[in-house]
Interface confidence: low
Amino acid sequence: AQNITARIGEPLVLKCKGAPKKPPQRLEWKLNTGRTEAWKVLSPQGGGPWDSVARVLPNGSLFLPAVGIQDEGIFRCQAMNRNGKETKSNYRVRVYQIPGKPEIVDSASELTAGVPNKVGTCVSEGSYPAGTLSWHLDGKPLVPNEKGVSVKEQTRRHPETGLFTLQSELMVTPARGGDPRPTFSCSFSPGLPRHRALRTAPIQPRVWEPVPLEEVQLVVEPEGGAVAPGGTVTLTCEVPAQPSPQIHWMKDGVPLPLPPSPVLILPEIGPQDQGTYSCVATHSSHGPQESRAVSISIIEPGEEGPTAGSVGGSGLGTLALA
């Protein structure tokens, strides 16, 4: 069969090969399309409701004034010329509709490096057959499920027209130190060959690089955090960031009810002061960042002190903030 593609809504003429150019003609058109349950036979005499859909022209060709989705199918003509020679024509008709230019909606103006971000949703409306949407970064195709790229797709059909609406949502994880202004675009590729792709206008979100925080250092005096009963321990939270963040203190994972301060002094150490201490620096732009934990323990005279970081008991004695 000869493949024919016709645009929805436009006229179509199919030639009946071998048919005499004018009546009388011995020819018959057979159709198996959406308008037929099986094969429908059309003759040059015509008449009836089919004339508005398809009719045989005086030269034997079949004329469809405006093809629709329901005209997809097989069209066959059998004609006999004046000498009694029979010729058959066989067509497979596919219809198509080019959608409007695709658009990117809900597009992000800023992306964060190192984490997944929604770039936007590409929408194409009014295609037939469905076709496909694909994304491009700086003009090169983006491959889903590769290098932090993921795509969520949805296909719907209009309840009356039968035309397709496609949606494609793009998520990316920009690499740290990558392009600060990447260019994304989306293109629609028709479901039938020989029709060029339609591309959206590009979008250029900014990529924001979160500044990696320098570590919060916790310094303990005396070193190792082991002290004789009645001694004093000084804990200092050092944060290189500017402006200085707020410093809060934790003991055994529980916040201490104290005003913010970078230094915590434990005077006259008693058993109740033993435990694991850490400090939490809260930056307005980065959120909280916790230091390593140190263990404060009491040693009786003559004992070796434990190494920093070992876990002691719990309790809360007298606290002093510098």
Epitope: G34, I69, Q70, E72, G73, I74, V95, A130, T155, G162
Partner: nanobody, 120 residues
Framework: EVQLVESGGGLVQAGGSLRLSCAAS????????MGWFRQAPGKEREFVAG????????LYADSVKGRFTTSRDNAKNTVYLQMNSLKPEDTANYYC?????????????WGQGTQVTVSS
């Protein structure tokens, strides 16, 4: 690859009912129209019923109108043929079929069929 699997056939007395199911896999089911056909031994395959992709449009052969009803559940990728008031002449192998690109194009994908036998 599209696969269609029919079930629900069997032996039934005249006047009885059967419900055939056709489960589809291999692509977006709710974008395509489905049809039911039957073929009795020594006879041509004949159209029985069709249903549009959305389910809101159905078509029936005159021989089954008022007795057979087709429906679809797009969430389950399944189309059904409810057959009531069955007659011995309904005895046949019943096939479900899917159309390739439109509601009304010729049917391109066919199931293996399920046998329905109506005894008098």
């Amino acid at each position: 690859e599209v696969q269609l699997v029919e079930s629900g056939g069997g032996l039934v007395q005249a006047g009885g009912s059967l419900r055939l199911s056709c489960a589809a896999s291999g692509r977006i089911f709710n974008n395509y129209a489905m049809g039911w056909f039957r073929q009795a031994p020594g006879k041509e395959r004949e159209f029985v019923a069709g249903i549009s992709w959305s389910g809101d449009s159905t078509l029936y052969a005159d021989s089954v109108k008022g007795r057979f009803t087709t429906s679809r559940d797009n969430a389950k990728n399944t189309v059904y043929l409810q057959m009531n008031s069955l007659k011995p002449e309904d005895t046949a192998n019943y096939y479900c079929a899917e159309k390739q690109g439109a509601d009304w194009a010729p049917y391109d994908y066919w199931g293996q069929g399920t046998q329905v036998t109506v005894s008098s």
